[in-house]
Interface confidence: medium
């Protein structure tokens, strides 16, 4: 029956001290891990991989390196200035045989707009990706190549959650056997046909994504063909039947009252840790109202926070969240009005999310300012608008054409924003820096890996 199918990939997620420094608390880090895993779970579960359906993800274990671990010699991710290939290698030098995949989340600004890196799975041979076991490689080191890394920073800015979720889905897509999309069928965002182009590129597009186009969180047919071949061959090696929650992964899942991790991680006076006997683990301790693992509206003293306490900061598009006094959850924040400016006036709020372009405020569409001969690139990091479906009207917000809306004020894209039709990202000097999708690969060829591994790592 379907329920007995091995369709769940169990994850080990580690975060480094810089990720912790950005999000501030263990609970906030766990919420980030949870949101990323749920996002890819939704994408993969709703994709039919040539008859293989309901592929899901579950966190088996987490390790959060806090700022206190910055000097810990047992923490391999403690070094401040590590390139993306080295960072992936540090993850791969650990033994991850107990997991389908092992990821590290960081907040580092890697070179050239790289947001992630992962080993690519293949249907045959020991090449990396899902279920790959630790082996000795030609540089004399044992490595687990069922690994990947992602960062939430790009050119000094933090990427929006939807982009980070797609980055994670993209890197996991490599682990599952998909190379980058190529060819007209699988890169519609590069099409000259406006109807095709407006839906954007798919998850495995090699360069940049905004995350808000129809295709951005879907796999292309190219990816589906590749992934289904790898799943066919590999999933029985390490996938498990879905169902039981995993007490100890720090996430409160169905059937658990709380989850503060294993005894070495649990700092929670409210919850029985995962090393406790079966009837007690991941249950609230007697007389305790809640556990901080359930949400930000529970105090360390195991009581619901009072009605007036803030649990979520006011953001560009949503008002602050206020605890309601009877649940650990942070209630929904009321959205700010649609078309409120956000992301430093480059975008507008839609249903509480900073999602639309500032152009939409005036009934226009965002476009890329690029001269047809490709020589004039100084406006590539301007916000440019056009009349709907009329690229001939595309002009910078600073142009005379749109002066009635923007009063001649040039609005520039935020650093880290996609530019030049998603071929690159804007840097801090407002230059559009093209993404070299295979840059780290080329550097790795000069490094420590043997030739048979070269084609099996990708951004």
């Amino acid at each position: 029956t379907t329920s007995a199918e091995k369709n769940t990939c169990q994850l080990y997620i580690q975060t480094d001290h810089l990720f912790f420094k950005y999000y501030g608390t263990r609970e906030a880090v766990i919420a980030q891990i949870s949101s990323h895993v749920k996002a890819i779970d939704t994408i993969y579960q709703t994709t039919d991989f040539s008859g293989i359906r309901n592929i899901s993800f579950m966190v088996k274990r987490i390790r959060i390196n806090t700022t206190a671990d910055e000097k810990d010699p047992t923490n391999p991710f403690r070094f401040p200035n590590i390139g993306v290939e080295k960072f992936l290698e540090l993850n791969s030098e650990q033994n991850h045989d107990d997991y389908c995949l092992a990821y590290v989340f960081t907040d580092r600004d890697f070179d050239d707009g790289v947001l992630g890196l992962a080993w690519v799975g293949a249907p045959s041979g020991s090449s990396g990706g899902i279920c790959e076991k630790s082996k000795l490689y030609s540089d004399g080191k044992k490595k687990s190549l069922n690994t990947g890394i992602i960062t939430v920073q790009n050119y000094g800015s933090h990427v929006p959650p939807k982009v980070s979720h797609i980055t994670f889905a993209h890197e996991v897509g490599h682990n599952f056997g998909s190379p980058h999309d190529s060819g007209t069928e699988c890169t519609p965002g590069e099409s000259k046909n406006l109807g095709q182009k407006e839906n954007g590129n798919y998850i495995m597009y090699a360069r940049a994504t905004s995350g808000d186009k129809l295709n951005n969180n879907k796999f292309s047919l190219c990816s589906i063909r590749n992934i289904s071949q790898v799943l066919e061959k590999k999933r029985n090696n390490c996938f498990v039947e879905s169902g039981q929650p995993i007490c100890g992964n720090g996430m409160v899942e169905q059937g658990e009252e709380c989850d503060c991790g294993y005894s070495d991680q649990c700092k929670d006076e409210c919850c029985f840790d995962a090393n406790q006997p079966e009837g007690r683990k991941c249950k609230l301790k007697p007389g305790k109202q809640c556990s901080p693992s359930q949400g930000p509206c529970c105090t360390a003293q195991c009581a619901f926070k009072s009605k007036s306490e803030k649990c979520r900061d006011d953001s560009d598009c949503a008002r602050e969240g206020i605890c309601n006094g009877f649940t650990a959850l942070c209630p929904a924040s009321d959205p700010k009005p649609n078309f409120t400016d956000c992301n430093r006036h480059t975008q507008v709020c839609i249903n509480g999310q900073c999602a639309g372009s500032i152009c939409e405020k005036y009934g226009l569409e965002e476009c890329t300012c690029a001269s047809s001969d490709g020589k004039d690139d100084k406006e590539l990091c301007h916000v440019c608008c056009m009349k709907k479906m009329d690229p001939s009207t595309c002009a910078s917000t600073g142009s005379v054409q749109w002066s009635r809306h923007f009063s001649g004020r040039t609005i520039t894209l935020q650093p880290g924003s996609p530019c030049n039709d998603f071929r690159g990202y804007c840097d801090v000097f407002m230059r559009c820096r093209l993404v070299d999708a295979d840059g780290p690969l080329a550097r790795l060829k000069k490094a420590i890996f043997s030739p048979e591994l070269y084609e099996n790592i990708a951004e």
């Epitope: 409160v252 899942e253 169905q254």
Partner: nanobody, 116 residues
Amino acid sequence: EVQLVKSGGGLVQAGGSLRLSCAASGNIFINNAVGWYRQAPGKQREMVAAMLSGGSTNYADSVKGRFTISRDNAKNTVYLQMNSLKPEDTAVYYCNVQVNGIWARWGQGTQVTVSS
């Protein structure tokens, strides 16, 4: 995008009962927190019942002992059983689900009117 379809509202006498249901597209309620909110005319929207992803439930003091939140994963549906209704329970009721740490957008809501 999450689609939430509410039903079960209506007019009821004080002391009566109603069951609201909220069906979702896909198995979105599994492993996600869900909540029922209400908004009475001229008042702030307030959460009245919540179910954490683990299944434990919490209620606003004003409805504790009268309202029960539950879910049926097989039907992708969340329910709010409302007993011993009072005129002050009159409001538009919304269900909501937390997806990727963000609460899904508000739907139309369903009107509940309790007459005395």
